[in-house]
Each structure stands twice: as C-alpha cells, then as structure tokens.
Amino acid sequence: PEPPTACREKQYLINSQCCSLCQPGQKLVSDCTEFTETECLPCGESEFLDTWNRETHCHQHKYCDPNLGLRVQQKGTSETDTICTCEEGWHCTSEACESCVLHRSCSPGFGVKQIATGVSDTICEPCPVGFFSNVSSAFEKCHPWTSCETKDLVVQQAGTNKTDVVCGPQDRLRA
C-alpha cells in the first residue's frame, strides 16, 4: 500500500508511517515501527505534559518562588502545570503570575478608576475619547485633552487615549 502522507488525529507521521502520539502525562520513549506500538513513559514527579505529544522530555512544573512572594495555588499533576498566586495582600503582575506587586499599575491608555485598598487591587479603565494617560500609574486617572479653544489656539495634532492634543497658532489670513 501507498505510504501515508497525513495521519489521523492523535497520530504523527514518521518514517512513512503513522504512529500514535503519547497521551498527556506521558513522554515518548521510542517511535512505533511496522511491528511495535509507540512506546511512552509517564512523566516523573514534578514534571508534566499537557497535550497529546511526541516530546522526549517532560516539562518541569513551575516553581512558585516564595522570595518573589509566590505560593502554590494549585499543585501540578503529570498533565497540568503548577499554578502560582501571590501571598495575601499582594497581586500578580501578569496572567502567568511570575512576580508580585503591592498593587498593579494601569498602562498608558488606561486610568485608575479605583486606587487599591488592603483587600482589592487597582481597578483600571480605558481612557474614553477626550481623555488620555501617557504613563503607567497605580494612582493617576485619565486626564482630559487640553482645550485649544480656551487658549485661542487650534488643534494641530489630534489627541489619542495615550497622548494629549497638540495646540498651535491659528492661521492668519494673508492680505
């Protein structure tokens, strides 16, 4: 028969034949042959693989470093990574929670809706049209664009959610 050019789901093509992938929680030891099945082995303690795979090494579980204020929220298994969170009163800097801060800052384009308290983190909101924030801040609200008209000037450059408008002199009509 013709050698396959594509394989079914949960299989992979090697040496012109389709082999079964290893299930989550297991790593590849040897590819299948004409006569043998794919050989897989369970991941060791503190290791995991979360997909059907042909990896020869399992991934190490994430380490929740207490020196960074991290602790284990959910212990990893052979099929899932460890999930870290921050100590009480601290907040993750990102979805991955790789370090902890007392309170998060709002990025440029966002302003502080509510300053952090002992129990809740900073609440950010996008700067609406007519307002901007050009800094990363845990305290500053969005600022209103400068009103060029009140200074007897005209808008030379439009504002954005991250930048103020640029005002300039009105064009004088030449005689």
């Epitope: 960074l68 800097t93 007392l102 800094v135 801040s137 500053e140």
Partner: nanobody
Framework: EVQLLASGGGLVQPGGSLRLSCAAS????????MIWVRQAPGKGLEWISA????????YYADSVKGRFTISRDNSKNTLYLQMNSLRAEDTAVYYC?????????WGQGTLVTVSS
C-alpha cells in the same frame, strides 16, 4: 541596581511630628511614581502615600489624609514624608518604594514609634 534607603524615624510622643527621607539611586528618579508604605508589628504592608514623577499629583490613604504630606526633590533624588499629629497606630516600619512596589525589593525601612 535600584537602591532605596529610608531614614528619619525615631521615638515620638502622640501628637508629635517627624519627617522621613528616602535616598534613591540606580534609576531615573524623576520618571518614577514613588510611594511610602508601612508595616505595623504583626501586620501586612499598608500603602499610605504616593506622588507622581513631577511631584504635581499626590495621593493619600484615608488613615493618614490631612496629617501626612508627601513631597520630592528630583534634583536630590530624594523622597520625603512629613508626618504630623502622630498617633500610636502610626507605629510601624516605614519603607519608600517606586511603583510598582515589588515583593522582592522593599529597600531599607525606618522605624517610627509613637508612644508616651
């Protein structure tokens, strides 16, 4: 390397005043929002005051509003906290920091004890 060194703490009677200073180095001071936090004995960290890079905007926790004043001198890379009408509950180690205030770096604090 970021270095933040708070000083000016001490023993003061209730109703008294103290001025804390924070010497900063290792970063562009005037570009950073700076804060004061404190840790009372057996308690967690409490944010008490913050100031924008320019010094134009200041922020205070309700617990110190009207009594404490934050300021900065960007030419000296120094942050200040003027504390008036001190109370026993203000007793704590005070730390200065730059935003965002990271768990892995608090700098050196200064102890303020309010007692008669």
């Amino acid at each position: 390397e970021v270095q933040l060194l708070a000083s000016g703490g001490g023993l003061v009677q209730p109703g008294g005043s103290l001025r804390l200073s924070c010497a900063a180095s290792g970063f562009t001071f005037e570009e950073e929002e700076m804060i004061w936090v404190r840790q009372a004995p057996g308690k967690g960290l409490e944010w008490i005051s913050a100031i924008s890079g320019s010094g134009g905007s200041t922020y205070y926790a309700d617990s110190v509003k009207g009594r404490f004043t934050i300021s900065r001198d960007n030419s000296k890379n120094t942050l200040y906290l003027q504390m008036n009408s001190l109370r026993a509950e203000d007793t704590a180690v005070y730390y200065c920091g730059k935003e965002p205030f990271r768990f892995d770096y608090w700098g050196q604090g200064t102890l303020v004890t309010v007692s008669s």
